[in-house]
């Protein structure tokens, strides 16, 4: 997250970190069910661990943390690497979470976002770009949903209805390491960090997010079919 600020503790209990060995964050994810996460399809890896209820990026033990293995990864059938359309994936955890103030699912919004909606994006991704500097703790950033026209104008021929753009003033954006993390609007999960300009936080180049309102049926049916 570029030019965000430290999230208040316990305010993002659905935020998950996907880790490669040794405790190496590579993507964010979101708890949407006691045993299921949503993340970006481009975050697919064969072997990874899931950390929930953790505030700092470092692997230091925190009393609220819960660790899991991902036992099943189900990318959306419409996703094709390395594209960005249909960029979402469900991950089944090896067991159900223990609900606490630090670990709690969030509902996926069935309403598509309208321009001007205020949202919050979070993650442990780099706070600088193009060089890399990871934060000590979870970062939060207020962003506004842009109209689909502004989104298409920013990225000609790259945007479809499985994506939406959101941003703020130049210099504020999601970035490397935030992929798959949540965009929360009006208390519901509206999007996942998907892609954006290179380097991040360029003027008139907003972040692009998976438009989850288009996938509520697939999410529900996939969880039911695999539970």
């Amino acid at each position: 997250i570029i030019n965000g600020s430290d999230c208040d503790m316990h305010t993002q209990p659905w935020q998950a970190a996907l880790l490669l060995r040794p405790n190496q964050l590579y993507c964010g994810a979101v708890l949407v069910h006691p045993q299921w996460l949503l993340t970006a399809a481009h975050c697919r890896k064969k072997v990874f661990r899931v950390r929930l209820g953790h505030y700092s990026l470092s692997p230091v033990y925190e009393s609220g943390q819960q660790m899991f293995q991902g036992v099943k990864s189900i990318p959306h059938p419409g996703y094709s690497h390395p594209g960005h359309s249909n960029d979402l994936m469900l991950i089944k955890l090896n067991r159900r979470i223990r609900p606490t103030k630090d670990v709690r699912p969030i509902n996926v919004s069935s309403h598509c976002p309208s321009a001007g909606t205020k949202c919050l994006v979070s993650g442990w991704g780099t706070t600088k770009s193009p060089q890399v500097h990871f934060p000590k703790v979870l970062q939060c950033l207020n962003i506004s949903v842009l109209s689909q026209k502004r989104c298409e104008d920013a990225y000609p021929r790259q945007i479809d209805d499985t994506m939406f753009c959101a941003g703020d003033k130049a210099g504020r954006d999601s970035c490397q390491g935030d992929s798959g993390g949540p965009v929360v609007c009006n208390g519901s999960l509206q999007g996942l960090v998907s892609w954006g300009d290179y380097p991040c936080a360029r003027p008139n180049r907003p972040g692009v997010y998976t438009n989850l309102c288009k996938f509520t049926k697939w999410i529900q049916e996939t969880i039911q079919a695999n539970s």
Epitope: Y26, C27, C43, Q131, Q176, D197, Y198
Partner: antibody, heavy 124, light 107 residues
Framework: QLQLQESGPGLVKPSETLSLTCTVS??????????WAWIRQPPGKGLEWIGN???????YYNPSLKSRVTISVDTSKNQFSLKLSSVTAADTAVYYC????????????????WGQGTTVTVSS | EIVLTQSPGTLSLSPGERATLSCRAS???????LAWYQQKPGQAPRLLIY???SRATGIPDRFSGSGSGTDFTLTISRLEPEDFAVYYC????????FGGGTKVEIK
């Protein structure tokens, strides 16, 4: 199958500007999933990264070359270009163009497709 | 800038032997941002490993990468005749840089 091909003059005079083009075939530059890079290798030496460009035109340059480098993209021709001004004999090298995958995960995917390289000699 | 120092400069081995190549960074680098390349004379570099330990598409499993912080290693478990080449590490954690290379030659 994606292929990259460098082209440009093989001989440049000192103090002039080196200009090279990389033509992309079998794939499209206007893709949000990749960036495009220039790397060089002086004779008998190692590799030096020059800079990257994204399809949108956003660039990232090697700080030691930044004052002399311009990388641009022409999506209509599926090409990207390198200009290096005020060249000296130290700029004599094989120049490569390459492609790298890009997303917002915290993973560097490396540069997976390279051109075969073009030799540029700086001499009067 | 982050300086990558590769050692040894030259490694003389026979086919079938194990090769261990070292790459040391002047400051800590996230392992996610380290790659290895192979280069043969007159050819462009070829991506072998990204993210310190993930094999690129089509790379045989005799190539493996490991390490974190400032110390990274490329291992070739059993050298094949086509593996004799120069190997470069590269970081993209800050402004991208390459190591000076290790030449693996036939003993």
């Amino acid at each position: 199958q994606l292929q990259l091909q460098e082209s440009g003059p093989g001989l440049v005079k000192p103090s002039e500007t080196l200009s090279l083009t990389c033509t992309v075939s079998g794939g499209s530059i206007p893709s949000s999933s990749y960036y495009w890079a220039w790397i060089r290798q002086p004779p008998g030496k190692g590799l030096e990264w020059i800079g990257n460009i994204y399809y949108s035109g956003s660039t990232y340059y090697n700080p030691s070359l930044k004052s002399r480098v311009t990388i641009s993209v022409d999506t209509s021709k599926n090409q990207f270009s390198l200009k290096l001004s005020s060249v000296t004999a130290a700029d004599t090298a094989v120049y490569y163009c390459a492609r790298g995958e890009y997303d917002r995960s915290a993973l560097y995917y490396g540069m997976d497709v390279w051109g075969q390289g073009t030799t540029v000699t700086v001499s009067s | 800038e982050i300086v990558l120092t590769q050692s040894p400069g030259t490694l003389s081995l026979s086919p079938g032997e194990r090769a261990t190549l070292s790459c040391r960074a002047s400051q800590s680098v996230s392992s996610s941002y380290l790659a290895w390349y192979q280069q043969k004379p007159g050819q462009a570099p070829r991506l072998l490993i990204y993210g310190a330990s993930s094999r690129a598409t089509g790379i045989p499993d005799r190539f493996s990468g490991s390490g974190s912080g400032t110390d990274f290693t490329l291992t070739i478990s059993r050298l094949e005749p086509e593996d004799f080449a120069v190997y470069y590490c590269q970081q993209a954690f800050s402004s991208p840089t390459f190591g000076g290379g290790t030449k693996v030659e036939i003993k």
